[in-house]
Amino acid sequence: ELDTPKDLQVSETAETSLTLLWKTPLAKFDRYRLNYSLPTGQWVGVQLPRNTTSYVLRGLEPGQEYNVLLTAEKGRHKSKPARVKASTEEVPSLENLTVTEAGWDGLRLNWTADDLAYEYFVIQVQEANNVETAHNFTVPGNLRAADIPGLKVATSYRVSIYGVARGYRTPVLSAETSTGTTPNLGEVTVAEVGWDALTLNWTAPEGAYKNFFIQVLEADTTQTVQNLTVPGGLRSVDLPGLKAATRYYITLRGVTQDFGTAPLSVEVLTEDLPQLGGLSVTEVSWDGLTLNWTTDDLAYKHFVVQVQEANNVEAAQNLTVPGSLRAVDIPGLKADTPYRVSIYGVIQGYRTPMLSTDVSTAREPEIGNLNVSDVTPKSFNLSWTATDGIFDMFTIEIIDSNRLLQTAEHNISGAERTAHISGLPPSTDFIVYLSGIAPSIRTKTISTTATTEALPLLENLTISDTNPYGFTVSWTASENAFDSFLVTVVDSGKLLDPQEFTLSGTQRKLELRGLITGIGYEVLVSGFTQGHQTKPLRAETITAMGSPKEVIFSDITENSATVSWRAPTAQVESFRITYVPITGGTPSMVTVDGTKTQTRLVKLIPGVEYLVSIIAMKGFEESEPVSGSFTTA
């Protein structure tokens, strides 16, 4: 029996052909018969020599399926057929050709094509009214769009395209369109004018120009200083390398392949060279300062600040600060020291002229003049002086001298110069310590002493105007401290009932009358506050004759003078006046009626100083004397 041909397969497919391959069978045979079906259902047969191992079916229809049978024959014997099924390739096709205006001197083509491996596309462009002007372009097979530049302005064109895939050429697609009108340059402006550069901006239609030509002239010399060509896609360009404070004339042209626009021009003045200005020192403290400066609004790379002691140029420190700053704090300086502070800026490799200023740091913060005022039994006020604007806080320590109380510490705002210290015990000695605290310093401590007042006491009980029938009691007391006073009067022998007098809290004295002459009395005064009684003050006296008062001399001559006095409150029988020269001698005496308050002294020696004493008398009682002196003419 004959072998079937081996490994029948389709090795290549094309739109109109299929390539078959197979292997020779082992058994001997004379020939092959190849049969394949047509789309119509018919079979076509081909006889092939025995040494054939491949065959190309040609003239097939694209995109159709074919059945292939291959048998080996020997005489009338046939092998079983080898079978294979295969389809021819689809015919490549182009569709949807669209042409859009690509600016005023070009067109843009878009098309669709099936996903075949196109080798290339052929595009033909010709003026609709001039067939001789045809241009052919070949573009790669992977593209589905193409720009056709270099056309005439406002011209009708016929555009055709076909594709080539595996040697097969698609049908041609065609379209008609027109290019746009000539573009115009818009406006040209200058932005970001610096001292050595500027930025040129302009407007123009998109895709209109191949490039732009820019010419820069110095306006005063008309000398061209720069020519440059930039791509047509740009709308802005930086022009560096200019001179400071110079007027420039700049022109701009748009350029196409065969066309240049009319130039647009602009005139501009570059800025002055950058320089620093307004160097000032603010917030000078004792250990630092703040430096401020002004500059033109340029992008400085950095500033270099140099600080040196005015009297010690070797002690210089340099500080580089970012170009965005216009102020810098310079710490770590010496107090009360003159400094020279300098600064320059660095911008695009250019170093501005240096600015300098002289400044002295403040004296080291000080506190002083710690004073105590407004002392009460439980509080006092403190005041002090201090360097302004330095201290964050003051610390006040209050320690009682006997160290019996817990130390009180008060922290007070650095803006304050006074403090009210309260809640203290009365009649207590205190030591007050004050120190100031600033960010980097605590001052030496200063101190003072303070003593709280005693509680409101009754004080200074005195007895005055003693006379035979009474006396005046007076005392001192704190204002508004007492609701009432109790005055108790007891005779020393405790023979009589005590007399009690209740007085208002505003009174400070009591005149006692109707007492017995010549006996001792004890007086007790105590105060009441909200029902609380003070311990009493005590005083003792004896009722007696009141003394005359206020001796006055008048009408003095060589040998006489008048003496006057004020009589005591109680009635007396008489006054005895004794007078004698101060240098010595026999005293002279005059007695006058108790109703009189003056008498004439006679038979005196000229130019002599006399000592005069006056006593009041009643029965056998004599008052204490009152004295005075005068000198005759």
Epitope: T376, P377, K378, P426, S427, E453, A454, L455, P456, L457, S478, A481, D483, S484, L486, F528, T529, Q530, G531, H532, Q533, T534, K535
Partner: antibody
């Protein structure tokens, strides 16, 4: 017979307010100064505030100054204590007491309990 | 801290004499007042001024003063005298001041 009767105590939250009253009888109310004294549980007596007979002068302990207000209505023979911004440490029995010109705190009421708690 | 200082506790045998003391700067100027307080009751004034007793207070209670110290003396203490005793005075700002109290135990 002198009688003093406090009222108005109770439970209040911290920061709250309370008004205590003390009804007086048996004496000429307008002639005498009055005081409030408090006693925290298990603690000693603490004077709180005082007012003169006419009501013209008032006195306060530092611990309540600015928060408590003492007043008296002589026409109603009543003493008041307005307590604002109450704190836990204000918890106590509050007594009202009478003061004579020469005798301190001679008569006391039986007290009213104020509890400040959340 | 209180402006008047008292001993926290004192004890006395029945019938014996006991002295309760109070110290403070205000006592240099003012006489102390003394109050007795029994559990659950309001305080009662027992001594005021130099040595004054309100009516109804037994004469076994007496007061004295020296310097910055005031004393309350109970001569012949009775069981019913067991109580807390508070001294009281007035300070410079017319504020009443109380001592911390003394617990008296009668044995």
């Amino acid at each position: 017979e002198v009688q003093l009767l406090e009222s108005g105590g109770g439970l209040v939250q911290p920061g709250g307010s309370l008004r205590l009253s003390c009804a007086a009888s048996g004496f000429t109310f307008s002639s005498y100064a009055m005081s409030w004294v408090r006693q925290a549980p298990g603690k000693g007596l603490e004077w709180v505030s005082a007012i003169s007979g006419s009501g013209g002068s008032t006195y306060y302990a530092d611990s309540v100054k600015g928060r408590f207000t003492i007043s008296k209505d002589n026409s109603k023979n009543t003493l008041y204590l307005q307590m604002n911004s109450l704190r836990a440490e204000d918890t106590a029995v509050y007594y009202c007491a009478k003061t004579s010109p020469r005798v301190p705190l001679d008569y006391w009421g039986q007290g009213t309990l104020v509890t400040v708690s959340s | 801290s209180s402006e008047l200082t008292q001993d926290p506790a004192v004890s006395v045998a029945l019938g014996q004499t006991v002295r309760v003391t109070c110290q403070g700067d205000s006592l240099r100027s003012y006489y102390a007042s003394w109050y007795q307080q029994k559990p659950g009751q309001a305080p009662v004034l027992v001594i005021y001024g130099k040595n004054n007793r309100p009516s109804g207070i037994p004469d076994r209670f007496s007061g004295s003063s020296s310097g910055n110290t005031a004393s309350l003396t109970i001569t012949g203490a009775q069981a019913e005298d067991e109580a807390d005793y508070y001294c009281n005075s007035i300070n410079s700002t017319r504020n009443e001041v109380f001592g911390g109290g003394t617990k008296l135990t009668v044995l």
